[in-house]
């Protein structure tokens, strides 16, 4: 595989050719790490250290802010707690969300007192509102950790917010929580390692399973110690895990909990010389591309290895079907801490645990009218045997000769003048973003990845944790703890003045236009449009 | 109803062993977590030890640590503490109680206790 | 000492309202945790009074209620009888080490 990027732009030169547009934050702010996009109003919100930023789409430069920090005796509490002042005593947002038309909801760590508001954005781009609504302040327990340096995963729909975080102060009770509404806080089992054990949340999601909304899930993408027995030594693993969006909790032992959560180990490995596979276990991001059917996005995961000595990062593409039948597979079991996982080989109870109470599937209204034999298996069984297996079963990135890892991941669907391609952009621990085209062989799942640029988008070496793509404004943002940067999807002057150059870079945002490299567009009727994606073959498409 | 009746307590030599049980009935005692706690002569109540539903999750105070060992057999719907090397400063009644997890946040209360036991730790 | 701080005792006549307070820190109450309140009669088990701030059990009078803000929390009791003579514990969560605490407790003395 060519691993050498077509091209390769440090800071200066991307600053030089005006590719990079960046905020360089603020002085008594810092962690510019949760993004919201709105295409509509043409904004990207920031959560940040005191802080949540509006920036305007178009420029970055451009920007509103709210100044939302802690009292001064809440941050002498945290200080009194043994905690850094700087890094850990202020308000870090952590939550950023749609709330309705006119509102967001934003929650910070709250000086270690987690804490959640509204913030005002008016009906209309023009209203040019935004504001703090100051008389409405909530507990952000359940949604927002405590401790800044945790990670949280968030979605708010309908009126209610799931978030994947930790509940206490000390960060040990970790809890997929749905919060807000008119309902009960509901959440996965406490003191259990086999429902989750120490993990790190990613993302959420909402997928529908069928047309009728009463099945639709909410899916968890994290990453969490693997539970002993499992694997010989410590070991991390990728999780999906799932919720459906109607469970209202069950009965008995499971009141005001999940009764639908089951989870699966995500594979994203490569066969080793020596028979055993380099696994990437280290979830770090997800994106899903959502294309033709909503039912049924591709799911592309970034990965890391847990090893201090080897150090490798990789993508993995999954499905959605491949998701579902795991679920629908057996449930790992275990007779006692001592035994090994083995696939359930029992009479599995009716309704099957994981089923959302709905007319599709089956004839139950509520998961409050679980059998008990239902409660008792979904309490012990929350995890499934088989895990889920990346597209083609192996990934469609790899990197392990590089003094980097990747961080981020966003996913662009592009019409060529062959076809459609997915270009990846990948954010880096060292603040760098390649761009990555998957190119299918024989089938469209069989790809080759051609790294098309690395580009420095960081004055210093910082680590990418945020990053959202419009493709309104052709644009990708990036965060990181020292700001946010902000470039364009393609720079095809730079591919060269040759036809021959643009047409070796196979950069589908790119074709020979009879003059110039320029951005190709599917809807121009040009003929001299010279582009080959698949082949890169400039002989072919080139008459100079 | 729920009943939970504690035994095993007595008069015991410092250094030496015992083993309370806690038998409960009235509830789903598989559901449950379950807990001691002591409360000596004269003083206030101390948590001892908490036990998840399936002995998955199992924490002590640091005052008993390494010492005390707590258990239970859903079986039997019965909760154990065994004690080892006692000392004078755990003389105390013991009781045993049920998490009962009744607020929103799902922060552990006590909703039933028992009468408790009496241990006696002298020489 | 305990975690969590009451006052040693309260005295009220009857048909009196008391308070009895509970203090604690940012990492027990102050950090957003629920605060439980059981009463204890002389020579019996303690028993669950609030839960959750301010929730009764059912068969608790309305006598009794629960508040929290900041660090500290606090038990009303109204119209005093001489049955509410006792004593009365707050607990709170605390995360590992130890998992819960408890406050010294509180003796109610009903005067006359």
């Known amino acids: 595989k060519n691993n050498v990027p077509r091209l390769k732009l440090s800071y200066k030169e991307m600053l030089e050719s005006n590719n990079v547009i960046t905020f360089n934050g603020l002085a008594n702010s810092s962690s510019y790490h949760t993004f919201l996009l709105d295409e509509e109003r043409s904004r990207l919100y920031v959560g940040a250290k005191d802080h949540i930023f509006s920036f305007d789409l178009v420029n970055i430069k451009d920007f509103q802010k709210i100044v939302w920090p802690v009292s001064y005796t809440r941050r002498d509490e945290c200080k009194w707690a043994g905690k850094d002042i700087l890094k850990e005593c202020a308000n870090f947002i952590k939550v950023l969300k749609a709330y309705n038309q006119t509102h967001l909801y934003a929650c910070g760590t709250g000086a270690f007192h987690p804490i959640c508001t509204y913030i005002e954005i008016g009906h209309h781009p023009e209203d040019n509102i935004f504001k703090l609504e100051n008389s409405h302040f909530e507990n952000g327990r359940g949604k927002s950790p405590y401790d800044p340096k945790l990670l949280t995963a968030s979605l708010l729909i309908d009126g209610e917010l799931y978030s994947g975080t930790a509940a206490d102060f000390m960060g040990r009770d970790f809890a997929i929580f749905r919060t807000l509404g008119h309902h009960h806080p509901i959440r996965t089992e406490q003191h259990d390692s086999r429902w989750l054990n120490d993990p790190k949340f990613i993302s959420a999601h909402l997928i529908s399973e069928s047309d009728n909304p009463e099945d639709d899930k909410v899916y968890f993408f994290f990453r969490e110690n693997a539970i002993d027995g499992e694997h010989s030594g410590k070991a991390t693993h990728a999780r999906i895990g799932q919720i459906c969006k109607n469970d209202f909790g069950g009965h008995r032992s499971l009141v005001n909990k999940w009764t639908t959560f089951l989870k699966a180990r995500l594979i994203c490995s490569v066969p080793g010389p020596n028979g055993i596979d380099t696994h990437f276990d280290e979830l770090q991001d997800v994106f899903l591309m959502n294309f033709k059917d909503p039912k049924n996005p591709v799911v592309y995961g970034v990965f890391t290895t847990s090893s201090n000595i080897f150090k490798g990062s990789a993508v993995c593409m999954y499905s959605m079907s491949d998701v579902r039948r795991v679920f629908l597979g057996p449930y790992a079991h275990r007779d006692g801490p001592n035994y090994q996982w083995v696939p359930y080989q029992g009479r599995v109870p009716y309704p099957r645990p994981g089923t959302c109470p709905s007319k599709t599937f089956g004839g139950f209204d509520s998961t409050k009218d679980l059998p008990d034999d239902v409660i008792t298996f979904a309490r012990s069984h929350p995890a499934m045997y088989n895990p889920v297996f990346p597209m083609n079963n192996r990934p469609i990135v790899i990197k392990t000769d590089v003094n980097y890892q990747f961080t981020q991941i966003v996913v662009d669907r592009v019409d060529a003048e062959d076809g459609q391609y997915d270009v990846m952009f990948i954010g880096t621990d060292v603040g760098t973003v390649l761009k990555v085209v998957s190119i299918p062989k024989e089938t469209w799942y069989d790809l080759e990845e051609v790294l098309l640029e690395e580009m420095t988008v960081f004055r210093e070496p910082t680590a990418i944790s945020a990053m959202e793509l419009s493709t309104k404004q052709q644009q990708l943002y990036i965060g990181s703890t020292a700001g946010v940067a902000q470039l364009p999807l393609h720079r095809c002057d730079i591919y060269g003045k040759a036809c021959a150059e643009c047409c070796l870079a196979r950069d589908p945002y790119c074709a020979w236009d009879g003059s110039a490299c320029s951005r190709y567009f599917p809807t121009a009727k040009r003929a001299t449009r010279a582009q080959d994606i698949r082949n890169g073959d400039p002989l072919t498409h080139c008459s100079d | 109803e729920v009943q939970l009746l504690e035994s095993g307590g007595g008069l015991v030599q410092p250094g030496g062993s015992l083993r309370l049980s806690c038998a409960a009935s009235?509830?789903?005692?598989?559901?449950?977590?379950m807990n001691w706690v002591r409360q000596a002569p004269g003083k206030g109540l101390e948590w001892v030890s908490g036990i998840s539903w399936n002995s998955g999750w199992i924490d002590y105070a640091d005052s008993v640590k390494g010492r005390f060992t707590i258990s239970r057999d859903n079986s039997k719907n019965t909760l154990y503490l065994q004690m080892n090397s006692l000392r004078a400063e755990d003389t105390a009644v013991y009781y045993c109680a049920r998490s009962g997890y009744s607020s929103s946040w799902f922060d552990p209360d006590f909703d039933y206790w028992g009468q408790g036991t009496l241990v006696t730790v002298s020489s | 000492q305990s975690v969590l701080t009451q006052p040693p005792s309260v005295s009220g006549a009857p048909g009196q309202r008391v308070t009895i307070s509970c203090t604690g820190s940012?990492?027990?109450?102050?950090?957003?945790?629920?605060v439980h309140w059981y009463q204890q009669l002389p020579g019996t088990a303690p028993k669950l009074l609030i839960y959750g701030n301010s929730n009764r059990p059912s068969g608790v009078p309305d006598r009794f209620s629960g508040s929290k803000s900041g660090t500290s929390a606090s038990l009303a009791i109204t119209g005093l009888q001489a049955e509410d003579e006792a004593d009365y514990y707050c607990q709170s969560y605390a995360g590992p080490n130890p998992y819960v605490v408890f406050g010294g407790g509180t003796k109610l003395t009903v005067l006359g």
């Open positions: 009235g509830f789903d005692f598989d559901s449950y977590e």
């Open positions: 940012s990492s027990n109450i102050g950090a957003g945790y629920d």
